[in-house]
Interface confidence: medium
């Protein structure tokens, strides 16, 4: 599924992303953005080995089981194909899991280069939330 | 247990196409990736592409773009693979395997003459 | 894309001996490699999977040792029914390559 910018706001306050571990949901509907372009059943390949899946481009090596990742942690405990549901219920709960890690949302690459700084409030303005 | 059950061998016209068939059972289906192999005599094997069943993500080997076509149907467990425009190279032994990285599941394999 | 090297091509052996079977990578690979086994009109059957780790089910003599960009396969005491190719494949990077394989036969 392709959310609709305000449809993948909606959904993520629904399931408790606004202001989780401080971060606003204009940052998470940026990283979104910049990450899967709000497509639940993005999967991109990286260089070692491991695969990034669903709308936040969850990486295989440490957070879900894809069955192929050599060393893959699954500190998720899920199978990556659950990532690319149109429901986000597992991306959202993985999710909080990986911000809550340390890094906060610097964990994904694309927010901090494309979100970090930035209006990310520009990012649900306009949405009936 | 796994098993992987492919469709009949096939010959085909120049210039055909074909579509191979690979029945999953004995596992879930959408969670593991199905990888596509060509085997030629004096050739080795060869790695088109892979399809993830729950998503319909597709990889491709470059070689392979324009020739081979993936799809899967999660309601019958199969996923396929169509090979257009056809030549005496696509002459081969296809098979398909589970894509756990290394491949411990394979199909039976399809063997496709053009001629 | 990464090469992968097979050697020799062809193995002779006699039944008993051991042998040992080559594949060279053209870059670094970790340890993500795997060697399969194929016989006449079968499938190829995973044997070593991550250079070293044995499958369930294949006999003890088969072993694996190797990381980076260097591999064998060892065959202690070669049987009859070892006879046919062998095959190494990465699992490093996209996208999945083989080795040309050796065949090992007989004496």
């Known amino acids: 599924k392709v959310f609709g910018r305000c449809e993948l706001a909606a959904a993520m306050k629904r399931h408790g992303l606004d202001n989780y571990r401080g971060y606003s949901l204009g940052n998470w509907v940026c990283a979104a953005k910049f990450e899967s372009n709000f497509n639940t059943q993005a999967t991109n390949r990286n260089t070692d080995g491991s695969t990034d899946y669903g709308i936040l481009q969850i990486n295989s090596r440490w957070w879900c089981n894809d069955g192929r990742t050599p060393g893959s942690r699954n500190l998720c405990n899920i199978p990556c194909s659950a990532l690319l549901s149109s429901d986000i219920t597992a991306s959202v709960n993985c999710a909080k899991k990986i911000v809550s890690d340390g890094n906060g949302m610097n964990a994904w690459v694309a927010w901090r280069n494309r979100c970090k700084g930035t209006d990310v409030q520009a990012w649900i303005r306009g949405c009936r939330l | 247990q796994v098993q992987l059950q492919e469709s009949g061998a096939e010959v085909m016209k120049p210039g055909a196409s074909v579509k191979i068939s690979c029945k999953a059972t004995?596992?879930?289906?959408?969670?593991?990736?199905i990888e596509w192999v060509k085997q030629r005599p004096g050739h080795g094997l060869e790695w088109i592409g892979e399809?993830?069943?729950?998503?319909?993500?597709?990889y491709y080997n470059e070689k392979f773009k324009g020739k081979a076509t993936f799809t899967a149907d999660t309601s019958s467990n199969t996923a396929y693979m169509q090979l257009s425009s056809l030549t005496s190279e696509d002459s081969a032994v296809y098979y398909c395997?589970?894509?756990?990285?290394?491949?411990?599941?394979w199909g039976q394999g399809t063997t496709l003459t053009v001629s | 894309d990464i090469e992968l090297t097979q050697s020799p091509a062809t193995l002779s052996v006699t039944p008993g001996d051991s042998v040992s079977l080559s594949c060279r990578a053209s870059q670094s690979i970790s340890n993500n490699l795997h060697w399969y086994q194929q016989k006449p009109h079968e499938s190829p059957r995973l044997l070593i999977k991550?250079?070293?780790q044995s499958m369930s089910g294949i006999p003890s003599r088969f072993s694996g040792s190797g990381s980076g960009t260097d591999f064998t396969l060892s065959i202690n005491s070669v049987e009859t029914e070892d006879f046919g190719m062998y095959f190494c494949?990465?699992?490093?990077?996209?996208?999945?390559?083989f080795g040309g394989g050796t065949k090992l036969e007989i004496k």
């Open positions: 399809i993830l069943p729950g998503s319909g993500s597709t």
């Open positions: 991550y250079g070293s």
């Open positions: 395997a589970r894509g756990d990285g290394n491949y411990y599941y």
């Open positions: 004995g596992y879930t289906f959408t969670t593991y990736w």
């Open positions: 494949q990465q699992s490093n990077s996209w996208p999945r390559t």
